[in-house]
């Protein structure tokens, strides 16, 4: 018996078609994605094979103006119209707190949402009882396939779950509710989930009875073969994972931001066991036509769009830089254009002795969400924005201790390499790393601007010293495991919204030009 | 509306076997359980077997397997449980009810079918 | 089979009593229980699954809690036409299985 899948992970907000970076779409005819698209490909095979199953693995939300303005109805009533078969929660899925993902996504979803691993407690128990699952058995053909769900424990220091729910380790949550499954019967079982690809690649080698895995969260590129589009693939597709109970159990995703739709193919024998697996993303370039019924639909609630954010804030004569290969690696132009504007808008020239009192802007790489294009004409909108800084977040100001920020810029480069989003894009400071240290011990160099002193320059950071600092509501919460700003922090005022403050630094200079200047070096 | 309509009352005699019918409406019938719940007179509820129209699966309670017999009828959105080899202690009110194939809480009932055994 | 313990097996109350009824199961079933109530010569009728969720058209007085092994039903108010046999029931674990039975009668 074959199956058929067909999945997304990380959409974005990526419900029009988009350049192919996945930033907003410039030349149409070299344009990729977007739902229109993805249903024509959907459709045609789902006219030519039988056993076809439309999976989602989740953080559809957050990343355009469509999520700014709909947050979150959009997802509902496309994926509705695309007739996707299930979801799994991302960790996305709460960055409106609870009410934001019940109301929109969760009551108003003709399919169903999984996740085994999160248990509501409280209040909110019997609210959202019953509006997500913990897995699925969908009829196929003449056979029923169990859905797993689960989303990544890291949830709460991503987003805004609140207090109400509880994120267990993935495995342990999953393995019962899989037994269960077997006990109905179910003898073909995927895992979907938002945990990562590490994290797909353990439960395909932990939970028993888990066939095929569909993941998320890491963007992770797959492929066999000469890969069609820029990404690079992290491996083959399907990656094999070897259980600890001797099956070969194949791990999937399908990098993010509605670019690819995966297309899995896996026979199975009569007792539910994996005979084959093959399969590769399909590039959904403008060779494929955009459904026109879906696309006149999107037209529609494009409308309220238009109005909201289509003016010109200014111009950029450069390429802003917003991916995660640059922002989670290195510097990025983008990272400085915004810690730029961060301490601009905090300019106050109260003391004499002072030419400001802040000078320090620190940025997690993973909150630069899309890079801006300089080929359409240089303009700058707020929607631009709105991709780039797509999490309604604040920039705000806090008094830290030198040795806090140590802490912070080793938290930093604690486990570089994977494209985590906590490497940290910075304003008026230099920092050196020697990643041939071992974590915890690879700063060799940080340099801050002074701020009491009237031509500025940049002076070693000195442990018992205290210095302000502006960054990202996100990270002085905690986020991203900035756990030592939370804890050390001895000041916090909030600030201005996050791409206000940016619009407004951009309408200022009228035309920007940020560089890579040599504010984050490796030894 | 949803609807389980049951057949009608049967007296049998210890050894013989019975067949009870269960016709669904209101509902796509091929995407539910039909599962077959006993209950003997003063006694509780006991769970005997479900049947998914989707595909044929059937899944027994231990206690009955090679007794009770448990058939689908698409055409006719019917499942029918037959149980052989009938003694007293098999009299009583025997239910179909509607579940989820991946939850089986029972939502909708059927009126019951009294099943008397009697030499 | 995992078995359900039901308790009490029958209890007297007035209206406008709050009820509580427990359930027990001999291992972990995972937050999958059912209640039921049944009037004499009728079918048993769902009032909760899932612990929590209330069968759509089922008074809010009807309310469940517990986790793991303990599950509880509690009746807010009792009201004349809730006098009735209550039944729990687990789906974890196949075969599905019922507990003995609460019979609330009018004291």
């Known amino acids: 018996w074959e199956l058929t899948i067909l999945h997304t992970n990380d959409v974005h907000s990526r419900l029009e078609q988009t350049s192919e970076d996945s930033s907003k779409c410039v030349n149409a005819s070299r344009c990729m994605g977007g739902v229109a698209r993805l249903f024509t490909k959907v459709q045609q095979i789902r006219r030519a094979e039988p056993n076809v199953l439309l999976l989602d693995a989740g953080d559809q939300y957050q990343g355009t103006i469509w999520f700014t303005v709909y947050k979150g109805a959009e997802v509902a009533h496309f994926m509705n119209a695309l007739r996707y078969d299930a979801m799994a929660l991302g960790n996305h899925e709460f960055d409106n707190g609870v009410e934001g993902l019940i109301e929109p996504l969760l009551k108003e979803a003709k399919f169903p949402i999984l996740s085994a691993n999160i248990k509501a407690k409280g209040p909110l128990a019997s609210q959202i009882s019953g509006l997500y699952l913990p897995y699925k058995v969908l009829p196929v053909g003449d056979e029923v396939v169990g859905i797993v769900g689960y989303t990544s424990k890291e949830t709460p220091f991503l987003s805004n779950p609140g207090t109400n729910l509880v994120f267990e380790d993935e495995i342990t949550a999953l393995q019962p509710e899989v037994d269960k499954l077997k006990t109905l019967n179910v003898n073909k079982i995927i895992a979907l989930g938002h945990s990562g690809f590490e994290m797909d690649k353990l439960i395909a080698q932990k939970v028993r009875g888990v066939d095929v895995v569909v993941g998320g969260h890491s963007n992770t590129f797959l492929y066999t073969g000469n890969p069609p589009s820029k990404e690079v693939p992290a491996g083959k597709y399907p990656f094999i994972v070897t259980s600890d109970d001797g099956r070969k159990v194949p791990v999937v995703q399908a990098y993010a931001f509605g670019k690819y739709l995966g297309y899995l193919k896996i026979e199975f024998d009569e007792r539910g066991n994996v005979i084959s697996s093959h399969g590769n993303p399909i590039l959904l370039n403008s060779s494929i036509p955009e459904d026109p019924s879906i696309k006149a639909d999107i037209n529609k609630w494009r409308i309220k769009l238009d109005n909201y954010s289509t003016q010109e804030l200014g111009k950029t004569i450069v390429y802003l830089d917003g991916s995660s290969q640059s922002c989670r690696f290195r510097e990025c132009n983008m990272g400085n254009l915004i810690c730029d504007a961060m301490i601009n808008n905090n300019l106050r020239h109260t003391d004499e002795m002072f030419w400001n009192h802040v000078s320090m802007c620190i940025l997690n790489g993973g909150g630069i969400r899309s890079p801006i294009d300089e080929r359409n004409n240089g303009t700058i909108t707020w929607e631009n924005l709105a991709a780039v800084l797509p999490f309604g977040g604040t920039f705000d100001l806090v008094q830290l201790k030198g040795s806090t920020l140590k802490k912070a810029f080793e938290h930093s480069v604690h486990r570089y390499g994977q494209s985590t989003g906590e490497f940290l894009q910075v304003g008026g400071i230099h920092v050196v790393y020697d990643l041939s240290r071992k974590p915890g011990d690879r700063v060799v160099k940080l340099d801050v601007l002074c701020t009491k002193c009237r031509v500025p320059s940049y002076d070693p950071l000195k442990m018992d010293e205290v210095y302000k600092v502006i960054l990202p509501n996100f990270l002085a919460n905690g986020g991203d495991g900035f756990q030592m700003i939370k804890d050390e922090l001895l000041r916090h005022d909030s600030g201005d919204q996050d791409i206000n403050v940016v619009s407004t630094y951009i309408s200022k200079m009228k035309v920007i030009y940020p560089a890579v200047e040599g504010r984050i070096k490796f030894s | 509306q949803v609807q389980l309509v049951q057949s009608g009352a049967e007296v049998k005699k210890p050894g013989a076997s019975v067949k009870v019918s269960c016709k669904a409406s209101?509902?796509?019938?091929?995407?539910?359980?039909i599962h077959w719940v006993r209950q003997a007179p003063g006694q509780g509820l006991e769970w005997m077997g479900a049947i998914f129209p989707g595909n044929g699966h059937i899944s027994y309670n231990q206690k009955f397997k090679g007794r009770v017999t448990m058939t689908v009828d698409t055409s006719t959105s019917t499942v029918y449980m037959e149980l052989s080899s009938l003694r007293s202690e098999d009299t009583a009110v025997y239910y179909c009810?509607?579940?989820?194939?991946?939850?089986?809480?029972?939502?909708?009932w059927g009126q019951g079918t009294l099943v008397t055994v009697s030499s | 089979d995992i078995q359900m313990t039901q308790s009490p097996s029958s209890l007297s109350a007035s209206v406008g009593d709050r009820v509580t009824i427990t359930c027990k199961a001999s291992?972990?079933?995972?937050?999958?229980l059912a209640w039921y109530q049944q009037k004499p010569g009728k079918a048993p009728k769902l009032l909760l699954y899932g612990v929590i969720s209330l069968e759509t058209g089922v008074p809010s007085r009807f309310s469940g809690s517990g986790s793991g092994t303990d599950y509880t039903l509690t009746i807010s108010s009792l009201q004349p036409e809730d006098f009735a046999t209550y039944y729990c029931q687990q789906y974890w674990s196949i075969p599905w299985t019922f507990g003995g039975g609460t019979k609330v009668e009018i004291k």
């Open positions: 291992e972990g079933i995972y937050n999958r």
């Open positions: 009810a509607r579940g989820d194939y991946d939850e089986s809480y029972f939502d909708y």
């Open positions: 209101g509902y796509t019938f091929t995407t539910y359980n």
